[in-house]
């Protein structure tokens, strides 16, 4: 393993597809993949009138957008479906939305507010 890289071997699993079929498929998913590919965890959810509705959580495979991210944070501004990914066992247990604002002229040192976490 590369020094400093957080290997992902398992992720929190949830799949609304299975839930609606009353099979209660939630748990811990082991992540499998080719030796030369990186493995990640992800979460995807909707915000319906301020209520968080998880769609899926589980393993995600070799995506450069997930490399070296220890926290699961969605940075897109107001997506229809929120998505985040991260590296490290069960790193998708908590996920957050923290849109990157386009600041044209900062007048002072920017302060990064702590993003809201959901779990």
């Amino acid at each position: 393993a590369i020094l400093g890289r957080s290997e992902t071997q398992e992720c929190l699993f949830f799949n609304a597809n299975w839930e609606k079929d009353r099979t209660n498929q939630t748990g811990v998913e082991p992540c499998y993949g080719d030796k030369d590919k990186r493995r990640h965890c992800f979460a995807t959810w909707k915000n319906i009138s301020g209520s968080i509705e998880i769609v899926k959580q589980g393993c995600w495979l070799d995506d450069i957008n997930c490399y070296d991210r220890t926290d699961c944070v969605e940075k897109k501004d107001s997506p229809e479906v929120y998505f985040c990914c991260c590296e490290g066992n069960m790193c998708n247990e908590k996920f957050s939305y923290f849109p990157e604002m386009e600041v044209t002229q900062p007048t002072s040192n920017p302060v990064t507010p702590k993003p809201p976490y959901y779990n």
Epitope: N15, K20, T23, E29
Partner: antibody, heavy 120, light 107 residues
Framework: QVQLVQSGAEVKKPGSSVKVSCKAS????????ISWVRQAPGQGLEWMGG????????NYAQKFQGRVTITADESTSTAYMELSSLRSEDTAVYYC?????????????WGQGTMVTVSS | EIVMTQSPSSLSASVGDTVTITCRAS??????LAWYQQKPGKAPRLLIY???SLHSGVPSRFSGSGSGTHFTLTISSLQPEDFATYFC?????????FGPGTKLEIK
């Protein structure tokens, strides 16, 4: 590397049942997501349902609900798909397939297919 | 049920060409879109998963893009072995559904 080997071709009468097996070689059978997909001659692909063996419960397409049963035997690393009340339109190649992840990112390993012919 | 449509249903191209196949979903499927290649008498083969991730062992001339309801598969510098039928599939919501296929023929 997982490999999936399916049982041989079947010829069945309308109204009867067929049970197709799918034996997996390689590790971690219990924690794989196994799906079944069928393809009628010259037609497209149709997802029937899937199972994660360690959970034991299957998820079915509404179209087949009540007529299909998907099971798995962890001791033999074998998944099964049983389809009952067969009709001529069930004539198809039936594939068992491994998914990349439990949340169904993509069907990456396919069995060789089992041809099921329903004819009187 | 999410209905998947593909266009064109068939196309002719020559070795070395670049071709693009489009897949549309009747509802948003986020990134849960895969592309498969199938040759006569053979099982389908996974090419692209999660809309744009290239599956292991698939040549880099295959690429996928899109999210939500509109997706594309592009094959650049067509090779003789690429002439086949291509299917898209959504796995965002059960029942998982496939497009009707696009048959890529040699010109």
């Amino acid at each position: 590397q997982v490999q999936l080997v399916q049982s041989g071709a079947e010829v069945k009468k309308p109204g009867s049942s067929v049970k197709v097996s799918c034996k997996a070689s390689g590790r971690h059978f219990g924690s794989l997501q196994i799906s079944w997909v069928r393809q009628a001659p010259g037609q497209g692909l149709e997802w029937m349902g899937g199972i994660i063996p360690i959970y034991g419960t299957a998820n079915y397409a509404q179209k087949f609900q009540g007529r299909v049963t998907i099971t798995a035997d962890e001791s033999t690393s074998t998944a099964y798909m049983e389809l009952s009340s067969l009709r001529s339109e069930d004539t198809a190649v039936y594939y068992c397939v491994k998914d990349l992840t439990w949340t169904n990112l993509g069907l990456d390993i396919w069995g060789q297919g089992t041809m099921v012919t329903v004819s009187s | 049920e999410i209905v998947m449509t593909q266009s064109p249903s068939s196309l002719s191209a020559s070795v070395g060409d670049t071709v693009t196949i489009t897949c549309r979903a009747s509802q948003g499927v986020s990134r849960w879109l895969a592309w498969y290649q199938q040759k006569p008498g053979k099982a389908p083969r996974l090419l692209i998963y999660a809309a744009s991730s290239l599956h292991s062992g698939v040549p880099s001339r295959f690429s996928g893009s899109g999210s939500g309801t509109h997706f594309t598969l592009t094959i650049s510098s067509l090779q003789p072995e690429d002439f086949a039928t291509y299917f898209c599939q959504q796995s965002y919501s059960t029942p998982f559904t496939f497009g009707p296929g696009t048959k890529l023929e040699i010109k």
